[in-house]
């Protein structure tokens, strides 16, 4: 439905508040280093322009595309060259190349200071003094640090952020009310960002077909009572929404997401029995709720898959007529029967089925050739099952911190060239799979664990892509989206790695460690552990554990000392000397 003025269309659809918020998010995700005030100024200018277009869609420049309007606005930033370097070259390009250029310069790990949470009273004062600016600042700070954050979902987070301050700033104990809510929003926000990053990577690196396959599998698990045609329609619409958001088209994305939520709620009866509560909520909550809704119950008496996909004499005929539709049906039928499988496993099974049909439909006796295709699935199913069983046992034995340490050692030995901060961040997140998924019954463990690991390994892939240092990481990240986890699992110790030269500075600690939170202290220790493995990749698990215990004893001793700094200096030297002697550093 063509509109004379796209900007007027979106302004009217979304309303002024959401329009301004989404433009701010878009700009902050593109120009991640720009000060808040500069972005607010740009957003206000765009908003005023949009209002003129709403008043008269034929007004000058109102017919321009959103990319043209937004790109022109971004290119007016005076400090573009000195702040962003070669990104300024994007401004010499025409649309659509200019937008593609901006997208390529999005930085997954921008050099921005860590967000430090002020005192509760300070935050409440700021909230009361200027609520609008306070909330805009939240959107800006999250968007610039997470340039692929799902924009309509960020509006939902901002709504909850506002609600937390509205409630807690008038509570008797403000901190007790507010801090747990902010912690929850922070943790959920990081998880949401990482999940969306995988969707964008899937679309951008592996194409629309890969994303659609993922969506067919996931939606079929979630809505097993829906017909294939219904699932296909939802997949098409969902793909459009995510393509837009990942492409920086945030106004279209938010608008289309609202339309999709509306459609789902109007057609609940043919989609899922679990949507009733979601559909009674306001728009942002509704969309979030639908995205997180539990799987519907499987229809009773689903026939065996073998009839249509193995035993039928028409398998090759049906496949040849419309390959992707037939494979889509296979994926739909398999996924709706298997909420206990991870999406990536279902996609591996579909790929195996496709490969078999490609080979067998060209054979002399196709049926004879593909008759045993389902037998090929068994090892593919058992591999993640066994891995999850082993790792959950290890997690239950060690607890989260020590399980993370085991993974740190494992992954540092696999890919020691990767930067220490990345190894620590990724291994810590991999280790969280234990507390997140191992508590679940068998039927929910695999979808929880393996699909979560896909999200975490994508973090490794996008961080590594910025500064590639390991061919093994590049290979696992680029060869196959669904086989990333098995690829990393299969990596053994990198025997070609030349141990890092010993640097005493890496193992020098100061009294500031004593005042850190438990989490920050763990990160310090885990950083030391990674460095230790990089210096001594041949060290045994037992030796590493023992050296880390010495480190813990050293920190504990010095944090109790009267002159902490002297203790850290003197005892630190002894610790390094002792470890060098013991491990031959």
């Amino acid at each position: 439905d063509a509109h004379k003025s796209e900007v007027a269309h979106r302004f009217k659809d979304l309303g002024e508040e959401n329009f301004k918020a989404l433009v701010l998010i878009a700009f902050a995700q593109y120009l991640q280093q720009c000060p808040f005030e500069d972005h607010v100024k740009l957003v206000n200018e765009v908003t005023e322009f949009a209002k003129t277009c709403v008043a008269d869609e034929s007004a000058e420049n109102c017919d321009k595309s959103l990319h043209t309007l937004f790109g022109d606005k971004l290119c007016t930033v005076a400090t573009l060259r000195e702040t962003y370097g070669e990104m300024a070259d994007c401004c010499a390009k025409q649309e659509p190349e200019r937008n593609e250029c901006f997208l390529q310069h999005k930085d997954d790990n921008p050099n921005l200071p860590r967000l430090v949470r002020p005192e509760v009273d300070v935050m409440c004062t700021a909230f009361h003094d200027n609520e609008e600016t306070f909330l805009k600042k939240y959107l800006y700070e999250i968007a610039r640090r997470h340039p692929y954050f799902y924009a309509p979902e960020l509006l939902f987070f901002a709504k909850r952020y506002k609600a937390a301050f509205t409630e807690c700033c008038q509570a008797a104990d403000k901190a007790a009310c507010l801090l747990p809510k902010l912690d929850e929003l922070r943790d959920e926000g990081k998880a949401s960002s990482a999940k969306q990053r995988l969707k964008c990577a899937s679309l951008q690196k592996f194409g629309e077909r890969a994303f659609k396959a993922w969506a067919v599998a996931r939606l079929s698990q979630r809505f097993p009572k829906a017909e294939f045609a219904e699932v296909s329609k939802l997949v098409t619409d969902l793909t459009k929404v995510h393509t837009e958001c990942c492409h920086g088209d945030l106004l279209e994305c938010a608008d289309d997401r609202a339309d999709l939520a509306k459609y789902i709620c109007e057609n609940q009866d043919s989609i899922s029995s679990k949507l009733k509560e979601c559909c009674e909520k306001p728009l942002l909550e509704k969309s979030h709720c639908i995205a997180e809704v539990e799987n519907d119950e499987m229809p009773a008496d689903l026939p065996s898959l073998a009839a249509d996909f193995v035993e039928s004499k028409d398998v090759c005929k049906n496949y040849a007529e419309a390959k992707d539709v037939f494979l889509g049906m296979f994926l739909y039928e398999y996924a709706r029967r298997h909420p206990d499988y991870s999406v990536v496993l279902l996609l591996r099974l579909a790929k195996t089925y496709e490969t078999t049909l490609e080979k067998c439909c060209a054979a002399a006796d196709p049926h004879e050739c593909y008759a045993k295709v389902f037998d090929e699935f068994k090892p593919l199913v058992e591999e993640p099952q066994n891995l999850i069983k082993q790792n959950c046992e290890l997690f239950e034995q060690l607890g989260e911190y020590k399980f993370q340490n085991a993974l740190l050692v494992r992954y540092t030995k696999k890919v020691p060239q990767v930067s220490t901060p990345t190894l620590v961040e990724v291994s810590r997140n991999l280790g969280k799979v234990g507390s997140k998924c191992c508590k679940h019954p068998e039927a929910k463990r695999m979808p929880c664990a393996e699909d979560y690991l896909s999200v975490v390994l994508n973090q490794l892939c996008v961080l590594h892509e910025k500064t590639p240092v390991s061919d093994r990481v590049t290979k696992c990240c680029t060869e196959s989206l669904v086989n990333r986890r098995p690829c990393f699992s299969a990596l053994e110790v990198d025997e070609t790695y030349v141990p890092k030269e010993f640097n005493a500075e890496t193992f020098t600690f100061h009294a500031d460690i004593c005042t850190l939170s438990e989490k920050e202290r763990q990160i310090k220790k885990q950083t030391a552990l990674v460095e230790l493995v990089k210096h001594k990749p041949k060290a045994t698990k037992e030796q590493l554990k023992a050296v880390m215990d010495d480190f813990a004893a050293f920190v504990e001793k010095c944090c109790k000392a009267d002159d902490k700094e002297t203790c850290f200096a003197e005892e630190g030297k002894k610790l390094v000397a002792a470890s060098q002697a013991a491990l031959g550093l």
Partner: nanobody, 124 residues
Framework: QVQLVESGGGLVQAGDSLRLSCAAS????????MGWFRQAPGKELEFVAR????????YYADSVKGRFTASRDNAKNTVYLQMNSLKPEDTAVYYC?????????????????WGQGTQVTVSS
């Protein structure tokens, strides 16, 4: 199961020396730090010394620093506590303990396996 057996305690005069030994059997001795603790009559169990897995790093309680020396011989699965310039206030039952997998290095709760103890009495 780990077994720890202390020996070498006895009755000595103030200013004398004693050497305690602790022989271990069971799980790999060289993988774990060892600790020495003591308990005087009517008092809490008190940290004395910790020696790391390789014998290259030792920590002592302030009350014994400069007088006591911990060492270990991993080939013999034995840890030692050389006690010089003994004082009457060193009188206690001395225990050796093998480090556990968590908890404080200076607290009994951080140690998993314990010997039965050996009595040290220092008369004035």
């Amino acid at each position: 199961q780990v077994q720890l057996v202390e020996s070498g305690g006895g009755l000595v005069q103030a200013g004398d020396s004693l050497r305690l030994s602790c022989a271990a059997s069971g799980r790999t001795f060289s993988d774990y730090a060892m600790g020495w603790f003591r308990q005087a009559p009517g008092k809490e169990l008190e940290f004395v010394a910790r020696i790391n897995w390789s014998g290259t790093l030792t920590y002592y309680a302030d009350s014994v620093k400069g007088r006591f020396t911990a060492s270990r011989d991993n080939a013999k699965n034995t840890v030692y506590l050389q006690m010089n310039s003994l004082k009457p206030e060193d009188t206690a039952v001395y225990y050796c303990a093998q480090r556990g997998d968590s908890g404080s290095n200076y607290d009994p709760s951080g140690y998993r396996y314990w010997g039965q103890g050996t009595q040290v009495t220092v008369s004035s």
